[in-house]
Interface confidence: medium
Amino acid sequence: FPHPQDCAQHLMNGDTLSGVYPIFLNGELSQKLQVYCDMTTDGGGWIVFQRRQNGQTDFFRKWADYRVGFGNVEDEFWLGLDNIHRITSQGRYELRVDMRDGQEAAFASYDRFSVEDSRNLYKLRIGSYNGTAGDSLSYHQGRPFSTEDRDNDVAVTNCAMSYKGAWWYKNCHRTNLNGKYGESRHSQGINWYHWKGHEFSIPFVEMKMRPYNHRLMAGRKRQSLQF
């Protein structure tokens, strides 16, 4: 893959170390994007599009910031709704959310993942759940994204304002991974309800995506190397 579209293609090219790599959306040189690739988790090939780990980056931001992205891809960041939409428009992607609290880890994966375009308010589309964290994201299925200055939820109140984040809020959330770091007050922190409830802020979270067929392709490559 001379111009990899995602981290899975980098991995197929032999780039086995996790780190920052350029990807080229739809294989076009003009659409270059620097992303963090997780090459080790569950077969690797993941584009990490969100990470929370120390509270150094403010995630209570406006629509414009969430559209284009913010932060440092080697630390805490949000890749940007436009980028997430463009990546997931390349084909079928799957989603994985990794969470850690000290030595305790949990994950949630969904066999489909896409985010619609700006005209459709970046609505979330996910498939079937698998994992150890419990399914807290399906509640948000089909919801548009909301920020403090773009209230697209179905609540009377402004969910983003109430819970100091930005998310695919409904009324309001089962999970709020862009909530306030370290905040244990009810529903205000980084929550995944079915794992740790709404009164615990998860210290480490990564959201990541990769082509759904990566496992199959990686398996074929391994087989071909054996002959």
Epitope: Y129, D135, A155, V156, Y193
Partner: antibody
């Protein structure tokens, strides 16, 4: 149109078993969680059990845990409730209800119910 | 389990009057609250979901409000077909629990 039809109710002795069925039509069955909710004669509503759209996750009220088993056959658009070790307090009208989501949330469509009477 | 407490239990009301039913959750539930209407011999019917959203086909005289622990169902002008029992239900966590019901009958 969306429809839920329950069956399998009847008169049963304490300690015996009964299996309720719910036939669904008019919607993509496996996209939605499904539930059983009961109502004892002259009383309020009590959620009994729920199951996710895929069937991978099941949920029970404490009052029936270990005695009742919820299941679904997505190929047949059917929901089931296997009720074992029945007690007099299980006597109720049992409703099958569709959720608005793939995980337990809100019941937007209800069947007309099937009556279960536990008595010696 | 989350306890849901409805009041009043019974509400005799003349046609045309405004009706207010309250529901209190024993713990914070954001806006995860639904209201159902049940007429004698019939299955419950969803009226309002997520505290304030009117289900399709439900008349606009019904409205819901509240968040956190305190919620209200309001019927702006009671019609003869509105005489029924109303239940609140929390969908915040399983087991999903219902209030004990409020019977609205003719005064």
């Amino acid at each position: 149109q969306v429809q839920l039809v329950e069956s399998g109710g009847g008169l049963v002795q304490p300690g015996r078993s009964l299996r309720l069925s719910c036939a669904a039509s008019g919607f993509t069955f496996d996209d939605y969680a499904m539930h059983w909710v009961r109502q004892a004669p002259g009383k309020g509503l009590e959620w009994v059990s729920g199951i996710s759209g895929s069937g991978g996750s099941t949920y029970y009220a404490d009052s029936v845990k270990g005695r009742f088993t919820i299941s679904r056959d997505n190929a047949k658009n059917s929901l089931y409730l296997q009720m074992n070790s029945l007690r007099a307090e299980d006597t109720a009208l049992y409703y099958c209800a569709k959720d608005i989501s793939a995980v337990p949330d809100t019941f937007d469509i209800w069947g007309q119910g099937t009556m279960v009477t536990v008595s010696s | 389990d989350i306890q849901m407490t409805q009041s009043p239990a019974s509400l005799p009301t003349p046609v045309g009057d405004r009706v207010t039913i309250t529901c209190r959750a024993s713990q914070y539930i954001q806006g995860f609250l639904n209201w159902y209407q049940q007429k004698p011999g019939k299955a419950p019917k969803l009226l309002i979901y997520d505290a304030s959203n009117l289900e399709t086909g439900v008349p606009s005289r019904f409205s819901g409000s509240g968040s956190g622990t305190d919620f209200t169902l309001t019927i702006s002008s009671l019609q003869p077909e509105d005489f029924a029992t109303y239940y609140c239900q929390q969908s915040y966590s399983t087991p999903q629990t219902f209030g004990q019901g409020t019977k609205v009958d003719i005064k």
